[in-house]
């Protein structure tokens, strides 16, 4: 017998649907109406035929009371080819819900997103997470999607993007966005970062994650941030193959004084990179290839230094820096 496509946990909290049949019974998803977290995976199906069965232009206010009663706070939709018109129809209906985090993954969005009608209300998301989503509209996708969202978005995460650079002139500012995660875009690089960090569009950024994004030097990242006027408090550069030395012809870059936490773990470093901020609250250099304990003059002034998992550290070795947070145990790096 075929397994049920949807499973709801005993607490009515999480509901996961995997529609793998060529002709799925979408009505099975109705058992998820009581769930707070909902995941729907469409098995790579093309949802174009759906447009014939639903009126994407219908006034969503007719569903408002029903949708307001839903408990869903987190929604993940994955593995499908979705017409932009259908996506917009869903966003218009979800605008009446209590949805706070939307994750789209492994999706191919076809066609262009129509502009937001005057009477329509945007979706009040706190967090939008995109992983391996391709858009027919190329670089203008973020601007098109943004108009369907209220301006209170606080977290934007874009991984495995087919076009990680945005059409900056079309993008409006994100006044509430405190966290931007561009991790897992290995082709981004420092030039791509400059293109993605549209100047003055991210005025409230406090946390910036750039794991596995093809960054080469901390100084290069510093220059990209300075050019964009982005001043994060926390910067994650882990899982990049970083060079410790700076190109002598490159101009020196002054880090923003706002930066107090820097993650350089899993970066293949054989020495402490040059050009780090002068003062940090947290510096993570764990799981690198440091063969000797860093000298005080190589390090910024730092309260919490993590050096676990480097070759020079034998379990039980004395801590090399005041205020360090080494466990003395070499982690699995």
């Amino acid at each position: 017998t075929t397994p049920e496509p949807c499973e709801l946990d005993d607490e009515d909290f999480r509901c996961v649907c995997n529609f793998s049949e060529p002709q799925p019974d979408w009505s099975e998803a109705f058992q998820c109406v009581s769930a707070v977290e909902v995941e729907i995976h469409a098995g790579g199906l093309n949802l174009e035929p759906f447009l014939k069965r639903v009126d994407a232009d219908a006034d969503p206010r007719q569903y408002a009371d029903t949708v307001k009663a839903l408990r869903v706070r987190r929604l993940t939709v994955g593995a499908a080819q979705v017409p932009a018109q259908l996506l917009v129809g869903a966003l218009r209906v979800l605008a009446y819900s209590r949805l706070k985090e939307l994750t789209l993954e492994d999706l191919k969005i076809t066609g262009t997103m129509p502009p937001l009608p005057l009477e329509a209300t945007g979706l009040a998301l706190s967090s939008l997470r995109l992983r391996n989503v391709s858009w027919a509209t190329g670089r203008s996708w973020l601007a098109e999607l943004q108009q369907w969202l209220k301006p209170g978005l606080k977290v934007l995460s874009i991984a495995q993007a087919h076009s990680p650079a945005f059409s900056c002139e079309q993008v409006r500012a994100f006044p509430a966005l405190t966290s931007l995660d561009l991790s897992d875009n290995p082709g981004l690089g420092e030039r791509g970062l400059m293109a993605a960090l549209c100047p003055h569009k991210f005025p409230a950024i406090q946390n910036l994650a750039l794991r596995n994004t093809g960054m080469e030097t901390p100084t290069g990242v510093c220059a990209a941030l300075a050019a964009a006027g982005v001043q994060p408090h926390s910067l994650d550069l882990s899982h990049n193959s970083l060079r410790a030395t700076v190109n002598p012809s490159a101009p020196r870059c002054m880090w923003s004084s706002a930066l107090n936490s820097l993650n350089l773990s899993f970066a293949g470093l054989e020495q402490v990179p040059k050009g780090l901020p002068a003062k940090l609250r947290v510096l993570d250099l764990s799981c690198n290839r440091l063969n000797r304990a860093p000298q005080p003059d190589e390090l910024p002034e730092v309260d919490n230094l993590t050096l676990d998992g480097n070759p020079f550290l034998v379990p039980g070795t004395a801590l090399p820096h005041e205020g360090s947070m080494n466990s003395g145990v070499v982690p699995a790096c």
Partner: nanobody
Framework: QVQLQESGGGLVQSGGSLRLSCAVS????????MGWYRQAPGKGRELVAE??????NYADSVLGRFTISRDNAKNTVYLQMNSLKPEDTAVYYC?????????????????WGQGTQVTVSS
């Protein structure tokens, strides 16, 4: 760990007023979205009012009667309830959306208070 402490509930006559307070035990208050929800006996929890960046949102049933405000210096959010009706009787819950704060930089996270009872008699 962020905790929310509500106060100000009680028994009031129809047409009367109450002011609910919600104190947040955290210094990240200034970037946190706050809201008030209520749950009447046998019903689901519904949004009453919320304060987010640059916008305030009210349930249709309380528009013009309830006002949400915040005091950043005291890490407190308030719900001023005027012209109360018997149908406003419910447990009122304070809600904080911590997404994007230092406590939850990259994922959605919210916390709820324990609730305060509001009873409106006719």
């Amino acid at each position: 760990q962020v905790q929310l402490q509500e106060s100000g509930g009680g028994l009031v006559q129809s047409g009367g007023s109450l002011r609910l307070s919600c104190a947040v035990s955290s210094s990240i208050f200034s970037i946190v979205d706050m809201g008030w929800y209520r749950q009447a006996p046998g019903k689901g929890r519904e949004l009453v009012a919320e304060l987010s960046v640059g916008s305030t949102n009210y349930a249709d049933s309380v528009l013009g009667r309830f006002t949400i405000s915040r005091d950043n210096a005291k890490n407190t959010v308030y719900l001023q309830m005027n012209s109360l009706k018997p149908e406003d009787t419910a447990v009122y819950y304070c809600n904080a959306d911590l997404t994007g704060s230092s406590l939850s930089p990259y994922r959605y996270l919210e916390v709820w208070g324990q609730g305060t009872q509001v009873t409106v008699s006719s």
